[in-house]
């Protein structure tokens, strides 16, 4: 602790100019004071002035008023500094002396004589208010006031709390009257060294080094650092955690750059044909009769759809066709028969039923056969019952679907998620693809399962050819070349006629 006991001498009266021993001063009592401050004593005793002592120069003769003086000789109030915790109690001895010698340093003069002395004992709290008092004896009167204040930068009831206002990186604060810290605007913490970030700045994803700032941690962006940054190269996708690429509807692939809804976005099928999406950038056109080609852009011969039934032969004509019917059949498509059940027209064990009073017939075919005369074996795969590229196989009276990897179910309609067992390490994001799961790794990791810590940028050497885009962190060898249309190979070095269905992994 550190403080100052201040004593203000106001007036001294010694009208008769007498000393304590009853003698008078000649020509008058040239008066100076000795002050001794010590710890509280119920009975004041001689001994060291434990809290300090001070002497004045000659302040006047006999009776006088003491003026305030801020500096130099004769300073008033008198200052008694201390470097300890103020105990709240004290003893004070004020002695008035006559000196025949030097005005400025009467202490050193021989022949000094005591005029009077007063002793004050009691309690005194630290504060700015002066306590005023007056002491009389038979010959003299002394008016004075006193107080205890803390030294600069010391605070509290006993001047024991040190506090120095500061505004640097170890604190931004001012000092309260009790010595506690009062943080400057924008700062918080026990030592006011923690900045208060921009209001709303995300607690985990943002931070600040000065007030009203919001600096985003890796993987986050936006004014309040509450928006994640998707994976580098993510085209048609979003994220809910950093470096993710969750595809928008209709898009697929590692970077959501593969069009799963090619039919809607590009309408590739011509001449009224039906378009079916079939995987990334894949589609199938189902042509109307009379058209062919990948996009049904080619017109067929009118006979291409085999319109003539019952073995009739078709002849193309300018805008139509003509059916030449075999014996026993007639009609535009040879659909009418002149045969009856008597002619045994039903093949492969079909049963004949007469119609129209025997003038025509109908065949009821056994299983696995069809046609008006049961002449055709049933192909149960014609309706394309297998989904997701499954292969249809006839098995006697039934058919089965042989599914591609990643699919199951009677019609290969169920997707098996390779990501269900969370194969990606270090927070990698899993994507189900045709050839198994692929992991999108966070910054600093690579490998098929993000198990490899990257120590260098594998793309820095420019390993991809033909304008391909290089990505790191997606494979054990640390980079992936995403080939442009017309190129394949681990580094997109081979030109081809067909687009690759998926980026080659180096």
């Amino acid at each position: 602790g550190s403080g100052i006991f201040q004593l203000r001498l106001q007036e001294f009266v010694n009208q008769r100019g007498m000393l304590a021993n009853g003698q008078s001063c000649e020509p008058g009592c040239r008066t100076f004071f000795r002050i001794c401050l010590k710890h509280f004593q119920a009975t004041f005793s001689e001994g060291p002035c434990t809290f300090g002592n001070v002497s004045t120069p000659v302040l006047g003769t006999n009776s006088f008023v003491v003026r305030d003086k801020n500096s130099g000789s004769g300073r008033n109030p008198l200052q008694l500094p201390f470097n300890f915790t103020w105990p709240g109690t004290f003893s004070l001895n004020i002695q008035a002396w006559h000196t025949p010698g030097d005005d400025l340093r009467p202490e050193t003069s021989p022949g000094n004589s005591l005029i009077s002395q007063i002793i004050i004992q009691g309690s005194l709290a630290v504060g700015k208010i002066w306590r005023t008092d007056e002491q009389n004896d038979t010959l003299t009167r002394l008016s004075y006031s006193y107080r205890v204040i803390c030294s600069d930068n010391y605070y509290g009831e006993s001047c024991s709390r040190l506090c120095k206002k500061r505004d640097d990186h170890f604190g931004h604060y001012e000092c309260q009257p009790d010595g506690s810290l009062s943080c400057l605007p924008g700062w918080t913490g026990k030592y006011c060294d923690q900045p208060i970030c921009l209001s709303g700045c995300h607690e985990q994803n943002g931070y600040c080094s000065k007030p009203d700032e919001c600096i985003c941690r890796p993987g986050w962006q936006g004014r309040l650092c509450n928006e994640c940054i998707p994976h580098n190269g993510c085209r048609h996708g979003t994220c809910s955690i950093p470096w993710q690429c969750a595809c928008d509807e209709g898009w697929g692939g590692l970077f959501c750059d593969q069009d799963l809804n090619y039919c809607t976005h590009h309408s590739p099928c011509k001449n009224g044909s039906t378009c079916s999406n079939s995987g990334p950038k894949g589609y199938t056109c189902t042509c109307l009769p009379g058209y062919t080609g990948e996009h049904c852009e080619l017109g067929l011969s009118k006979c291409a759809s085999n319109p003539c039934r019952n073995g009739g032969s078709c002849k193309d004509q300018e805008n139509s066709y003509h059916c030449l019917c075999p014996p026993g059949y007639y009609g535009q498509h040879c659909e009418h028969s002149t045969l009856t059940c008597a002619d045994s027209p039903c093949f492969n064990g079909g049963s004949c039923r007469e119609r129209n009073q025997g003038s025509s017939y109908a065949c009821e075919c056994p299983p696995n056969f069809t046609g008006s005369n049961c002449e055709k074996k049933v192909d149960r795969c014609t309706s394309n019952p297998c989904a997701n590229g499954g292969q249809c196989q006839n098995r006697g009276p039934s058919r089965t679907c042989r599914c591609r990897p990643g699919f199951t179910g009677t019609h290969c309609e169920l997707h098996i998620s390779d990501c269900a067992r969370s194969p990606c390490a270090h927070g990698g994001t899993c994507h189900d693809l045709e050839n198994g799961p692929v992991c999108t790794c966070p910054a600093g990791f690579s490998g098929r399962r993000c198990e490899v810590r990257i120590t260098h940028d594998a793309c820095a050497s420019g390993p991809c050819f033909n304008g391909a885009t290089c990505y790191t962190g997606l494979s054990p060898n640390n980079f992936v070349c995403n080939c442009p249309y017309g190129f394949v190979g681990s580094r997109c070095e081979f030109p081809v006629g067909l687009p690759p269905s998926f980026p080659w992994v180096a």
């Epitope: 600069d152 206002k165 640097d168 990186h169 170890f170 604190g171 030592y191 000065k210």
Partner: antibody, heavy 121, light 106 residues
Framework: EVQLQESGPGLVKPSETLSLTCTVS??????????WGWIRQPPGKGLEWIGD???????YYNPSLKSRVTISVDTSKNQFSLKLSSVTAADTAVYYC?????????????WGQGTLVTVSS | SYELTQPPSVSVSPGQTASITCSGQ??????ASWYQQKPGQSPVLVIY???KRPSGIPERFSGSNSGDTATLTISGTQPMDEADYYC?????????FGYGTKVTVL
Amino acid sequence: EVQLQESGPGLVKPSETLSLTCTVSGGSISSSGYYWGWIRQPPGKGLEWIGDINYRGSTYYNPSLKSRVTISVDTSKNQFSLKLSSVTAADTAVYYCAREDVILRGGSDYWGQGTLVTVSS
Amino acid sequence: SYELTQPPSVSVSPGQTASITCSGQRLGDKYASWYQQKPGQSPVLVIYEDSKRPSGIPERFSGSNSGDTATLTISGTQPMDEADYYCQAWDRDTGVFGYGTKVTVL
């Protein structure tokens, strides 16, 4: 107990960049309430404060060196680093790293053992 | 720039009191720290916040700071106290060291 260890080349050519790393063990560099500083002492002379950094990357530099100094932190490795560019013979000194404590009002309670860097061709 | 001035050397007899001063403009309004450095060793903090001792520092080391002067006092000086002593304070965001005082125990 917290320990600090300086590392880096002991000899640097004039006009090149001096690079040193301080590795902190026995405590986390990411603790709040600390700054991590660099101080140097030319042979036979006094201490000179170079600059400091906290775990968030807030840096403060001695104005007399500011144009040449960069201090960075790598919390994942519990390290902080000093780069001093365009060095001259006057940059020859023992370089210390130290922990500055907010509770100690900026006093440095832990120091590295120092590493002598000589600038000479 | 802010400067802290120390006497280059102070001599003291064993058992006597050594006082080292450190002067700077309004230094009393800043927190002063003191470091002891022996030859070939790193500095050691002996006083922080003007007058506080870190654990392990002997009681004979004390400090004060007011006005323009901070003082490190070593009472009952021992031969092992022979070392260089540096005062340090912060001027805004810059650390400032005094020039150092060599204490010789005669």
